[in-house]
Interface confidence: low
């Protein structure tokens, strides 16, 4: 195989969770390299992952400029010993990607919980994103606002019948039976989306009259 033989990239796929966004493709290159370009408008291309032998490229910094914009990337194939020429190398375009609509919601973490009498209070950790404004990072709630809901699935520890509660904050306060232990998990939901509406469910936590151990953090939570 000559060094000028290149294969056009295929299976271009966006992998994105809480706005951390990576473009993946195939195949592994032999004697050639890839350059990724990304643009919110076809033709105004920005180079990323220049002359790489990887088959993935982190484009988070670029898509963060405007998470409601629609982006297209393309993967260009160059011979490994290439010199820059005016000739355009072969390339493949990605599917369009709109971060605000298309990024997957990450698994939520239950920050804390407490059962007092007939009330169960559950707080979801305010997940940070990689959306950066002036060098600092926004929380999921800051980006999605009221579009972001959380669903709490809860059930008596002694039974399997699940109940459901929803909030557009990061806190739940629900009525439970006094003296009963409860188990629960949470899920992030964006109801206005057509796809990628729901996150994976969080780890399950359970209350106890003395204490419960969070499997997420390994720390002890004390309860009444």
């Amino acid at each position: 195989t000559g060094t000028t033989d290149v294969i056009v990239a295929y299976n271009l796929t966006w992998k994105s969770t809480n706005f951390k966004t990576i473009l993946e493709w195939e195949p592994k290159p032999i004697n050639y390299v890839y350059t990724v370009q990304i643009s919110p408008r076809l033709g105004d291309w920005k180079n990323k992952c220049f002359h790489t032998t990887d088959t993935e490229c982190d484009v988070t910094d670029e898509i963060m400029r405007n998470v409601k914009e629609t982006y297209v990337a393309r993967v260009l194939s160059y011979p490994a010993d290439t010199v820059l020429t005016a000739q355009e190398p072969p390339f493949t375009n990605s599917p369009p990607f709109t971060p605000y609509l298309d990024t997957n919601l990450g698994q939520p973490v239950i920050q804390s919980f407490e059962q007092v009498g007939t009330k169960l209070n559950v707080t979801v950790e305010a997940a940070r994103t990689l959306v950066r404004v002036n060098g600092t990072f926004l929380r999921l709630r800051d980006v999605f606002g009221k579009d972001l809901n959380y669903t709490l699935y809860y059930w008596r520890a002694s039974s399997t019948g699940k109940k459901k509660a929803t909030t557009n904050t990061n806190e739940f306060l629900i009525d439970v039976d006094k003296g009963e232990n409860y188990c629960f998990s949470v899920q992030a939901v964006i109801p206005s989306r057509r796809v990628n509406q729901k996150s994976p469910e969080s780890r399950i936590e359970c209350t106890s009259q003395e204490k419960a151990v969070s499997r997420e953090t390994g720390h002890h939570h004390h309860h009444h």
Epitope: V133, L138, R141
Partner: antibody
């Protein structure tokens, strides 16, 4: 270097509305969270609430029904309003910048810039 | 609400001595969101430690933070005259963000 300058009425009667403003000099409102904290005479610090870069707000539930925090990006200012004040609202009120910081895979969150404080007294 | 309990309320020490301040949370707190502040009379609080362990810009290395879960500690290895002040811990992980009641470090 970012500095916060705050001002507002220092003496109020019960049932009036406390109104304070904090101006950001040497930096932008964008990308940070902006908090109000108060400290009653001889006591500790109490977080009142914050406004985020996107305009989203979070309030202390104990004050939520009376508090409004707003932002004016054109003036690089944010403001606190606390309605129906009583003597229990007498305190030094501070504005502060909350900085979320990402480093080596972890997030940190802290108040790194503070105003000098405004003494507010509620008395009939 | 996460309650932060600081102890002791007052610490009477001499310059050059070691100060150990405790902050205990009513529920587990992510160390990423635990900070320590110093406050002197008539002044605003000043950030000392963030992320439970990291010194803020310009803070001398005699200040150090440690701990995790529900128990956190601020240590001043050798007290300087300017270190006599009130120290507060704060959690910023769960709304409402809360401060401890403070520990006053005074000259013995």
């Amino acid at each position: 270097q970012v500095q916060l300058q705050q001002w507002g009425a220092g003496l109020l009667k019960p049932s009036e509305t406390l109104s304070l403003t904090c101006a950001v000099y040497g930096g932008s409102l964008s990308g940070y969270y902006w908090s109000w904290i108060r400290q009653p005479p001889g006591k500790g610090l109490e977080w009142i609430g914050e406004i985020g870069a996107s305009g989203s707000t979070r309030y202390n539930p104990s004050l939520k029904s009376r508090v409004t925090i707003s932002v004016d990006t054109s003036k690089n200012q944010f403001s606190l309003k606390l309605s129906s004040v009583t003597a229990a609202d007498t305190a030094v009120y501070y504005c502060a910048r909350d900085t979320p910081y990402y480093y080596e895979g972890g997030y940190y969150y802290y108040m790194d810039v503070w105003g000098k404080g405004t003494t507010v007294t509620v008395s009939s | 609400e996460i309650v932060l309990t600081q102890s002791p309320g007052t610490l009477s020490l001499s310059p050059g001595e070691r100060a150990t301040l405790s902050c205990r949370a009513s529920q587990s707190v992510s160390s990423s969101f635990l900070a320590w502040y110093q406050q002197k009379p008539g002044q605003a609080p000043r950030l000392l430690i963030y992320g439970a362990y990291s010194r803020a810009t310009g803070i001398p290395d005699r200040f150090s933070g440690s701990g995790s879960g529900t128990d956190f500690t601020l240590t001043i290895s050798r007290l300087e005259p300017e270190d006599f002040a009130v120290y507060y811990c704060q959690q910023a992980g769960v709304v409402p963000y809360t401060f401890g009641g403070g520990t006053k470090v005074e000259i013995k």
